[in-house]
């Protein structure tokens, strides 16, 4: 039985040109994490394999950095980065757990009037 739960950073608003950290945390299970995939829509951004380490998709190499931990750092944000991101935890023996984070990237003109924009 899958008893685990995934906690995420929560949805994020960020400013164009900035950077943000996407993080998920798997809790309430003793299952072994074998691999974590980071995806946006149907695009694979990065893989963190327990044995082989990190692999960043070539098309994202310039703007995606591994970590911290099993998280992912997105840099030089563009409006086109707005969307839903998935952390997919492959575990043994439980199977797959998925977390979801929505990112909204805003023009800096909006940032002057908008939420507390998040640039670490």
């Amino acid at each position: 039985m899958m008893t685990g739960t995934i906690e995420t950073t929560g949805n994020i608003s960020a400013e164009k040109g900035g950077s943000i950290i996407l993080q998920c945390h798997l809790s309430s299970t003793t299952a072994q994490v074998t691999q974590v995939n980071w995806e946006q829509q149907d695009q694979l951004l990065a893989i963190c394999n327990a044995d082989l380490g990190w692999h960043i998709s070539p098309s994202f190499k310039d703007r995606v950095a591994p970590g911290p931990g099993l998280g992912l750092t997105l840099q030089s944000l563009t409006v086109n980065d707005t969307g839903e991101y998935f952390c997919i935890y492959h575990t043994y023996p439980d199977g797959t757990y998925t977390g979801r984070i929505f990112l909204e990237v805003l023009e800096s003109s909006v940032a002057e009037h908008g939420a507390r924009f998040q640039i670490p």
Epitope: N11, E84, R100, A111, A115, Q118, P120
Partner: antibody, heavy 119, light 112 residues
Framework: EVQLQQSGPELVKPGASMKISCKAS????????MNWVKQSHGKNLEWIGL????????SYNQKFKGKATLTVDKSSSTASMEFLSLTSEDSAVYYC????????????WGQGTSVTVSS | DVVLTQTPLSLPVSLGDQVSISCRSS???????????LSWYLHKPGQSPQLLIY???NRFSGVPDRFSGSGSGTDFTLKISTVKPEDLGMYYC?????????FGGGTKLEIK
């Protein structure tokens, strides 16, 4: 003035599908997320999902994944929602609602589209 | 999914009363950057829902200052300082911090 004009009421048979439209005016359509909300029994509100007109990206409430499909037509500033394999549980009022940038809230709402599923 | 519990379900009032509506979340609505995406809506019969408060405490354009929002983490409150006839209807809280977005069950503000 921001306006979201939804298509008219629908009476559909069980098993059929239907498509509701939401025409936006008074603002730059591609710059704002569009949400869809279901209201059943005159009370409960449920978030169905959203679409990003700028890049066509979507996010669905898993409950409605495979049931609802969200699309946009940028040329006419129109968002649409198709509902598949309708059952009596899908009888409700459906709203489109513009996202408030930076705050994950909904600032302007359409007038609602009433959908009745009945044989 | 995050569950939002609103209390009371029904709130009988007299015009001029001060009232409070509570919205409690099953988990914290503050993201890892310190932002909290909690908003309040009024749904009047025969109309569409209307945004009152966003980001816990920001009044939306045109919303009278008798409406105020407060709270943090998992506990949030909407206050109406002096109830007017046009305030009657269903009030809902909405969280947009976690996917999927979820609404509270609603609070009906009605005349005693």
């Amino acid at each position: 003035e921001v306006q979201l004009q939804q298509s008219g009421p629908e009476l559909v048979k069980p098993g059929a599908s239907m498509k509701i439209s939401c025409k936006a005016s008074g603002y730059s359509f591609i710059d704002y997320i569009m949400n869809w909300v279901k209201q059943s029994h005159g009370k409960n509100l449920e978030w169905i999902g959203l679409i990003i007109p700028y890049n066509g990206g979507t996010s669905y409430n898993q409950k409605f994944k495979g049931k609802a499909t969200l699309t946009v037509d940028k040329s006419s500033s129109t968002a649409s929602m198709e509902f598949l394999s309708l059952t009596s549980e899908d009888s409700a009022v459906y709203y489109c609602a513009r996202g408030l940038r930076g705050y994950y809230a909904m600032d302007y709402w359409g007038q609602g589209t009433s959908v009745t599923v009945s044989s | 999914d995050v569950v939002l519990t609103q209390t009371p379900l029904s709130l009988p009032v007299s015009l001029g009363d001060q009232v409070s509506i509570s919205c409690r979340s099953s988990q914290s609505l503050t993201n890892s950057y310190g932002s909290t995406f909690l908003s309040w809506y009024l749904h009047k019969p025969g109309q569409s829902p209307q945004l009152l408060i966003y980001g816990i405490s920001n009044r939306f354009s045109g919303v009278p200052d008798r409406f105020s929002g407060s709270g943090s983490g998992t506990d949030f409150t909407l206050k109406i300082s002096t109830v007017k006839p046009e305030d009657l209807g269903m009030y809902y809280c909405l969280q947009g911090t976690h996917q999927p977005w979820t609404f509270g069950g609603g609070t009906k503000l009605e005349i005693k």
